[in-house]
């Protein structure tokens, strides 16, 4: 019998400070390029070696990013996504939502990931 | 991980033309910012030029203008580059490059650096 997947999702504040290269991250989504079905949020889709997201170690490919200095990135297109990034100055705070995949035992077993009971 | 196969590379006289083919893999090519480098023999990689995930941007080297074409078909997950009017000085290894998604900061297409993964290359003589 096969295990169940489950996601553990948790948010987080993450304030970065823009390095001489920028920020350091790809992203991917927006209302014209749903990366996730039924879902245009935004989402890392790169953290770049030595830049500043990767330095503060926080941020992590696939984490999807829901505000930028307090401001909502629901039903943004792409490009304004991009935009808003590269236009939130040197101090960035990013809201952000990690998703944490959590192998449980077969159904109807407990396994030693499953917290219950 | 993301695969990148160029084809249509060759031997071409001066002043004809050839289509050069990036095939890739992934469900998420849409998503894809990709580009064409190339090398010639005792020289450094060369930008070439580079296309945005839905083709509404593109970008060229000065050496290039007027003559190369870089285009997208993202239902096919493929990228091309139409090269006319070769010159001998275009003879080189080609290569196809990617980067999921789009940079944050300001974009340098020129910037190997820009790009996670790479094909293999694909040979362009022009004689």
């Known amino acids: 019998m096969n295990g169940r997947v489950d996601y553990l999702v948790t948010e987080e504040e993450i304030n970065l400070t823009r390095g001489p290269s920028g920020l350091g991250f790809n992203i991917v989504g927006g209302t014209d390029q749903q990366y996730v079905s039924n879902d245009s949020g935004i989402y890392v889709s790169r953290i770049k070696e030595n830049g500043a997201a990767a330095l503060d170690g926080r941020l992590q490919e696939g984490d999807k990013i829901l505000s930028v200095n307090g401001q909502d990135l629901k039903n943004l297109l792409h490009q304004d996504a991009v935009d808003l990034f590269r236009n939130a100055g040197y101090a960035v705070s990013l809201r952000v939502q990690h998703r944490l995949q959590v192998q449980n035992g077969p159904i109807g077993h407990r396994g030693e990931g499953d917290p219950s009971g | 991980e993301v695969q990148l196969v160029e084809s249509g590379g060759g031997l071409v006289q001066a002043g004809g033309s050839l289509r050069l083919s990036c095939a890739a893999s992934?469900?998420?090519?849409?998503?894809?910012?990709m580009a064409w480098f190339r090398q010639a023999p005792g020289k450094e990689r060369e930008f070439v030029a580079a296309?945005?995930?839905?083709?509404?941007?593109?970008y060229y080297a000065d050496s290039v203008k007027g003559r190369f074409t870089i285009f997208r078909d993202n239902a096919k997950n493929m990228v091309y580059l139409q090269m006319n009017n070769l010159k001998p000085e275009d003879t080189a290894v080609y290569y196809c490059?990617?980067?999921?998604?789009?940079?944050?900061?300001?974009?340098?297409?020129?910037?190997?650096?820009?790009?996670?993964?790479w094909g293999q290359g694909t040979q362009v003589t022009v004689s």
């Open positions: 992934g469900r998420t090519f849409s998503t894809y910012t």
């Open positions: 490059a990617a980067a999921i998604g789009s940079t944050v900061d300001s974009y340098d297409p020129g910037d190997p650096l820009e790009y996670d993964y």
């Open positions: 296309i945005s995930w839905n083709g509404g941007s593109t």
